[in-house]
Amino acid sequence: YDFTNCDFEKIKAAYLSTISKDLITYMSGTKSTEFNNTVSCSNRPHCLTEIQSLTFNPTAGCASLAKEMFAMKTKAALAIWCPGYSETQINATQAMKKARKSKVTTNKCLEQVSQLQGLWRRFNRPLLKQQGSSDYKDDDDKHHHHHH
């Protein structure tokens, strides 16, 4: 899915209002320095691509994130604010249901959610260029410069 046409500011609002709190709850008791952030993103569409991948794609050692509250709210936000997103996720949802029935919090999952927090932080606060400056290299975000 190409996230270019999403309403980034609405997704940001959804994240700040609810999703972030669910991530904090999931990570409660974990030190912020416990994991090194190795996943990064360069612009808002790219951040959403990485967020989707980490949230919904089962990985070795962590197959259960898709059933977490933050994941369900992320899915809802993307479905509402990204045109055509829901249609692309029907097959993925079926696969998810088959993949895992129970929620298990592993150290690998905690590490993955720590990565997610970094991706969301980057998504929310890209360094957007002002009109007239030329030091920002990310063309995908140019038209969002007034919605920092």
Epitope: K10, A13, L16, T33, S42, Q117, F123, N124, H148
Partner: antibody, heavy 120, light 111 residues
């Protein structure tokens, strides 16, 4: 403990340059926007600019764009602010600050400040 | 640039009394239903400290005598019962649009 430790006070001549450092510890430096703020005597706070250590992207206040340069050294988790062509009105305390954990955009951790005095 | 104007410039309030500081933005700092306005407290010789984020959310470890309200262009910081340790300069900050801008500051003293 999450903290930012800045370099010591500097006294500079007009026309020269100053480079202030800000060493981060206790958090994953590369994933947080780092900001610089000026506080001149008897005046308010003024945003200079910000840098994302992950890839070095910067955003500047146009007022400082021609004279301020923000850089980072990821290997030492240090942010730098260089100010060139110094003049008397650059006399101020300069702070580095980290954006919050959640992308709210507030500055939750600040350095102790570096006093820069520009005098002939 | 969005200009942030605080009022008053200085304020003297008796201990235990209410203190109110206003901040007006030259244009709206709201986006998608959220107000991207923060408040800081700065004491002499110290860096600023976050008090409230997004207009009304209390920062970590901040006593609940501090509260904030407002949206769009008009915001208010209230201290319900002034304590001696609240003597400081208070700043509002908008982060909705680059460049990020602060108010000129309001100096709060004890009457």
């Amino acid at each position: 403990e999450v903290q930012l430790v800045q370099s010591g006070a500097e006294v500079k001549k007009p026309g020269s340059s100053v480079k202030v450092s800000c060493k981060a510890s206790g958090f994953t430096f590369s994933t947080y926007n780092m900001h610089w703020v000026k506080h001149a005597p008897g005046q308010g706070l003024e945003w200079i600019g910000a840098i994302y250590p992950g890839n070095g992207e910067t955003s500047y206040n146009q007022k400082f764009k021609d004279r301020a340069t923000l850089t980072v050294d990821k290997s030492t988790s240090t942010a730098y602010m260089e100010l060139s062509s110094l003049r008397s009105e650059d006399t101020a305390v300069y702070y580095c600050a980290r954006e919050d954990d959640y992308g709210e955009g507030y500055f939750d951790v600040w350095g102790q400040g570096t006093t820069v005095t520009v005098s002939s | 640039d969005i200009v942030m104007t605080q009022s008053p410039d200085s304020l003297a309030v008796s201990l235990g009394e209410r203190a109110t500081i206003n901040c007006r933005a030259s244009e709206s700092v709201d986006n998608s239903g959220l107000s991207f306005m923060h408040w800081y407290q700065q004491k002499p010789g110290q860096p600023p400290k976050l008090l409230l984020y997004r207009a009304s959310n209390l920062g970590s470890g901040i006593p609940d005598r501090f509260s904030g309200s407002g949206s769009g262009t008009d915001f208010t910081l209230t201290i319900s019962s002034l304590q001696a340790e609240d003597v400081a300069v208070y700043y509002c900050q908008q982060i909705n649009t680059d460049p990020l801008t602060f108010g000129q500051g309001t100096k709060l003293e004890i009457k």
